[in-house]
């Protein structure tokens, strides 16, 4: 196993990303050397800058996209798979993943899912609670989905160390970032914290921990004291504006 | 309510290959990563491998790498481990379990590796 | 690899008894990335808590989880009849996940 880079009591492993893709074709092995990932998709990127980005499945875009076949709004189906913006209310959908923020797919439509809709004792509890009784009618298009409601607990927020599939689905000051092979509430970045930031899109590669983006009034900037150092080896840091 | 059953154990010879299953229902498996761990009798336990929700992303302890092979079929809702290459020392109780730290698991099936 | 030490293997106590059981890591988790497990004999594990100290769905109140950095503790507050069991952490905050070896948790 590789040795671990503890920086800012975060026990990160860095491998350079390889270049292109999304990082591990379907069913393959893939290495368990993590590195650390992207600022999730297309999310930081200008209309004029803007270049498709590759993914393999939801997890691997932002908050607001969903990874699909550019020419077909399903993501699973042959050929390459890019981030996609995501549906607003009363679009189709699929799968949940496709509808925006505070939207879940219910019968094959972007609906709201706020919780204003649901009488108390019914609001239907999010992924992260690790209750299973999904019977939605989206279910069973296989699919991934990015966001579960199920059964009829009051929705609670997950606290750090919590399985998420959005950030919505976390507590404040936490974001859902891939780890391993799932992905879990962990703490947004504060000022001074080691981030990630990726020149290259779609050079993310296979990144088994994922840290959080930095937090509000905060921007991933090179530190200062390492403008010296190679392209490879330079340190970005969450920085103020 | 959910459900995880395993099938596929059994015995067989050092070197030999099986396939285990891990049939889900009652929540929505592709929501879900995935994962094998296994208990050798008397024992405790070990993590085998995992799996993302798409199946795009596959992952293994040291002990199997290179012999063991986790998939699954979203459309079937089934998980599925490949074992080749067994050893004696593969024998334990295999059980497939919801998510990265595991909230649900299956009654685990028993696979022996002996001649 | 992170070694999850448990202690004491084993711990008799009667039941209402108050029990804590010990999980050491080697290093240092930095994240709440804990979980602890009960097994009953000849059954599968159940989740009891996850993060450190969030109890898992349908877990009784008696059961809390704590603890940061190298050292986390289950605490059962008043052992019932049906505690008895052996209590895994598994820890799932670097690579590869790996489990405590257990506590036994017997009836004196």
């Known amino acids: 196993t590789l040795n671990s880079v503890l920086i800012n009591s975060n026990a990160i492993k860095n491998l350079p990303p390889p270049l292109g893709g999304a990082g591990g074709q379907p069913g393959s092995a893939v290495s368990v050397a993590p590195g650390v990932l992207y600022e999730g998709g297309n999310k930081y990127q200008t209309l004029d800058n803007y270049q498709p980005y590759p993914c393999a499945e939801d997890e691997e875009c932002g908050s607001d996209e969903y990874c699909s076949s550019p020419s077909r709004g399903a993501a699973g189906v042959g050929g390459v798979q890019i981030c996609l913006a995501c549906r607003k209310r009363r679009k189709r959908c699929m799968r949940h993943a496709m509808c925006c923020p505070g939207n879940y797919c219910k019968n094959g439509i972007c609906m709201p899912s706020d919780h204003s809709h649901f009488p108390r004792g019914e609001i239907e509890e999010s992924i992260i609670e690790n209750l299973g009784n999904d019977h939605n009618a989206a279910a069973g298009d296989g699919y991934p989905r990015r966001t579960t409601l199920t059964s009829k607990i009051y929705h609670t927020k997950g606290q750090e160390g919590s399985v998420c599939l959005r950030s919505s689905d976390c507590a404040a000051g936490l974001c859902c970032a891939r780890h391993f092979w799932s992905k879990i509430c962990k703490p947004v970045l504060k000022e001074g914290q080691v981030c990630t930031k990726h020149k290259r899109k779609g050079s993310h590669g296979l990144e088994i921990f994922q840290r959080c983006y930095c937090g509000e009034g905060l921007a991933c900037r090179i530190q200062k004291d390492h403008h010296q150092a190679s392209n490879s080896s330079r340190l970005h840091t969450c920085q103020r504006h | 309510q959910v459900q995880l059953v395993e099938s596929g154990g059994g015995l067989v010879q050092p070197g030999g290959s099986l396939r285990l299953s891990c049939a889900a229902s009652g929540f929505t498996f592709n929501n879900y990563g995935m994962t094998w761990v296994r208990q050798a009798p008397g024992k405790g336990l070990e993590w085998v491998s995992g799996?993302?929700?798409?199946?795009?992303?596959?992952y293994y302890a040291d002990s199997v790498k290179g012999r063991f092979t986790i998939s699954r079929d979203n459309s079937k809702n089934t998980l599925y481990l490949q074992m080749n290459s067994l050893r004696a020392e593969d024998t334990a109780v295999y059980y497939c379990?919801?998510?990265?730290?595991?909230?649900?698991w299956g009654q685990g099936t028993l696979v022996t590796v002996s001649s | 690899d992170i070694v999850l030490t448990q202690s004491p293997a084993t711990l008799s106590l009667s039941p209402g008894e108050r029990a804590t059981l010990s999980c050491r890591a080697s290093q240092n988790l930095f994240s709440p990335y804990l979980a602890w497990y009960q097994q009953k004999p000849g059954q599968a594990p159940r989740l009891l808590i996850y993060?450190?100290?969030n109890r898992a769905t349908g877990v009784p109140a008696r059961f809390s989880g704590s603890g940061s950095g190298t050292d986390f503790t289950l605490t059962i507050s008043s052992l019932e009849p049906e505690d008895f069991a052996t209590y895994y952490c598994q820890q799932y905050g670097d690579e590869p996940i790996t489990f405590g070896q257990g506590t036994k948790v017997e009836i004196k």
């Open positions: 993060g450190a100290s």
């Open positions: 379990a919801r998510t990265i730290y595991m909230d649900y």
């Open positions: 799996i993302s929700g798409s199946g795009s992303y596959t």
